[in-house]
Each structure stands twice: as structure tokens, then as C-alpha cells.
Amino acid sequence: SGRGEAETRECIYYNANWELERTNQSGLERCEGEQDKRLHCYASWRNSSGTIELVKKGCWLDDFNCYDRQECVATEENPQVYFCCCEGNFCNERFTHLPEAGGPEVTYEPPPTAPT
């Protein structure tokens, strides 16, 4: 049974490809899903020689590997696109890379700008 999960209703939204996909670039996303299914937030990004390039942020449908994650932490060593998910409103505002091989933990803070 699920116990004490943080309910996710809103996530930080971002789309680097917003012009092509004809969406907003950034803001808040209200999560919608089927009854009895859990919802999560996610973040995805690239890391080019230490420069973080945000790809997308938003809501993520019920995914068991996201259950009970309070923080958005990616663990893959060196993927093309880093991915993390979490539960709780706006939990994808900050995201972290904590490689499984035990490298340094790197946390990315959002720039202090208002959503558009």
C-alpha cells in the first residue's frame, strides 16, 4: 500500500524547445492524471563541459521509480540527457546529479527570475 506520499499537483514548467513546439517557455504546470494514479514532477538537462543546459521540466505521469522521492536526483553516470523525478509540489525547482560511481554531488539552483 502507498503510505504518506507527497501529493503532486503543480510542477515547475520549462521547455527549451518552446518556439518549435509552440508552448510557453517557462512557468507553472498544473498536473492532471487518471484517478488513483500518482503524479510526479521531473527535470531533464544536458551538461556540456560543466555548462548546464535545461531541456524540460514539468509534470510526469505515474512512474514507480519516482515514488517517495522528495528531491529530484539523477544518478546516471554520463547520459546524453540527465533525468530526475520527484513527488511534491514544485519539487523539480532544484535538481541534483549524484552519480552512482560516487563522484561529486552537483546541485543546480534555479536562477532568481520570475516565471513567464
Partner: antibody, heavy 118, light 111 residues
Framework: EVQLLESGGGLVQPGGSLRLSCAAS????????MSWVRQAPGKGLEWVSS????????YYTDSVKGRFTVSRDNSRNTLYLQMNSLRAEDTAVYYC???????????WGQGTLVTVSS | QTVVTQEPSFSVSPGGTVTLTCGFN?????????PSWYQQTPGQAPRTLIY???TRSSGVPDRFSGSILGNKAALTITGAQADDESDYYC??????????FGGGTKLTVLG
């Protein structure tokens, strides 16, 4: 290299108990959801139970609810399945599996055989 | 009770193409069920082939592909080889922690 090593299987009488263990290595265990899947002799695969990264959420197939308990010790990198009130129909090879994003099983152990017979 | 259905058996000639399907009794399979496919040979642990409908797992040859066909998930094997003779299982994630396996398809490669 990811490794999942099940142990604890064996022969047990109906109504008896067993505890299966799955020792994990080669990945950050505390950051992975985990599952148990079983296969009765000559039959197909059947999902048995899953547990979230913290252990705070656990789920079971209907036929084992109230009899089986899944748990994990993240400090020991070990997954457990406590099986009580065992029945003949629980006879199977039990696999532990790592769950990845998109809710799929990306790595499997080699399995441990549980035989329930008098 | 959700029942996931697969063809019990299928045969294919070497070099041929075969499509195995995976449906369920309470609606259409969509990408939100994260369909995944596994190959198992007798006495061995399952091997992950396809996840998230159509993404090949690491090391899986591109002869294997996944898709949604109509209201079912599908696994297509093109250029079938003798060592593709195995049991194939689909899994649907129903949400709320519940995974459901199909009954499996026994694939025979003729000749």
C-alpha cells in the same frame, strides 16, 4: 556491473514460512525501486511485489496480500521478501528485479527456487 | 482484475518478420502503460528487450522494435534468427505500483 543475487529459497511445508533476500551491487540501491517476480514450473512470469526507494510504498499481487511482506535495508543494499502461510501454488523460482524510470525491470537476478510441499 | 493477453505461440521462418502483440481486457494499451518486453530462454532469467513502448534496452539488436498497433502493444522481430527462439513476455504498468505480465508467447523459429 549491476548484480542481483537472490538467496533463501528451499523446501518448506504448506503453512510454513521463508524469507528471501536479494543482495544488490553495482548501482545505488537506495535510489532504485525494486520488485519481486516469480515463475511457477512450466508457467509464465508473474509480478509479486514492489517497493519504492524509501520503502514507504509497497504493493502486492492479490494472491499474496496479507501473507507476503516486502522490505528493504538500504544500508545493507538488500531487498527481502518475507513469505508466510505458504501454499503449494507459491512454488516457483523467485526473481528480484531493479525497477527503472518508465516502470520497467532493467536488471534481473538469477532467481531462487521455493518449493512448497509436504 | 486486469488480464494481459498475448498469443500463446507463434512461428517464423529464419530471416522472416514476426509481430507479437499485447492487449488487455479493460481498454486500449497506450504509452501511459509504459509497455515493456522481455525475452526468456528455458532455465535463464529474463532479459529486457524494449521499454517505454519502443526504446531498445542496452545491447539489444535493432532487429527488435516496439510500437503500439491499434489498441495493443507490439514487439516486431525482423530478420528472425535461430537464437530468437524463446518465450517473450510483455508487461503493462497499471499505475499505483501494479505491474501485470502477459501470459507469454512461445516463439518457434522454423527449420
Amino acid at each position: 556491473e549491476v548484480q542481483l543475487l537472490e538467496s533463501g529459497g528451499g523446501l518448506v511445508q504448506p503453512g510454513g514460512s521463508l524469507r528471501l533476500s536479494c543482495a544488490a551491487s553495482g548501482f545505488t540501491f537506495r535510489n532504485s525501486a525494486m520488485s519481486w517476480v516469480r515463475q511457477a514450473p512450466g508457467k509464465g512470469l508473474e509480478w509479486v511485489s514492489s517497493i519504492s526507494v524509501t520503502g514507504g510504498s509497497t504493493y502486492y499481487t492479490d494472491s499474496v496480500k496479507g501473507r507476503f511482506t516486502v522490505s528493504r535495508d538500504n544500508s545493507r543494499n538488500t531487498l527481502y521478501l518475507q513469505m508466510n502461510s505458504l501454499r503449494a501454488e507459491d512454488t516457483a523460482v523467485y526473481y528480484c528485479a531493479k525497477v527503472y524510470y518508465y516502470s520497467f525491470f532493467d536488471y534481473w537476478g538469477q532467481g531462487t527456487l521455493v518449493t512448497v510441499s509436504s | 482484475q486486469t488480464v494481459v493477453t498475448q498469443e500463446p505461440s507463434f512461428s517464423v521462418s529464419p530471416g522472416g518478420t514476426v509481430t507479437l502483440t499485447c492487449g488487455f481486457n479493460s481498454g486500449s494499451v497506450s504509452t501511459s502503460y509504459y509497455p515493456s518486453w522481455y525475452q526468456q530462454t528455458p532455465g535463464q532469467a529474463p532479459r529486457t528487450l524494449i521499454y517505454n513502448t519502443n526504446t531498445r534496452s542496452s545491447g539489444v539488436p535493432d532487429r527488435f522494435s516496439g510500437s503500439i498497433l491499434g489498441n495493443k502493444a507490439a514487439l516486431t522481430i525482423t530478420g528472425a534468427q535461430a537464437d530468437d527462439e524463446s518465450d517473450y513476455y510483455c508487461v503493462l504498468y497499471m499505475g499505483s505500483g501494479i505491474h501485470v505480465f502477459g501470459g507469454g508467447t512461445k516463439l518457434t523459429v522454423l527449420g
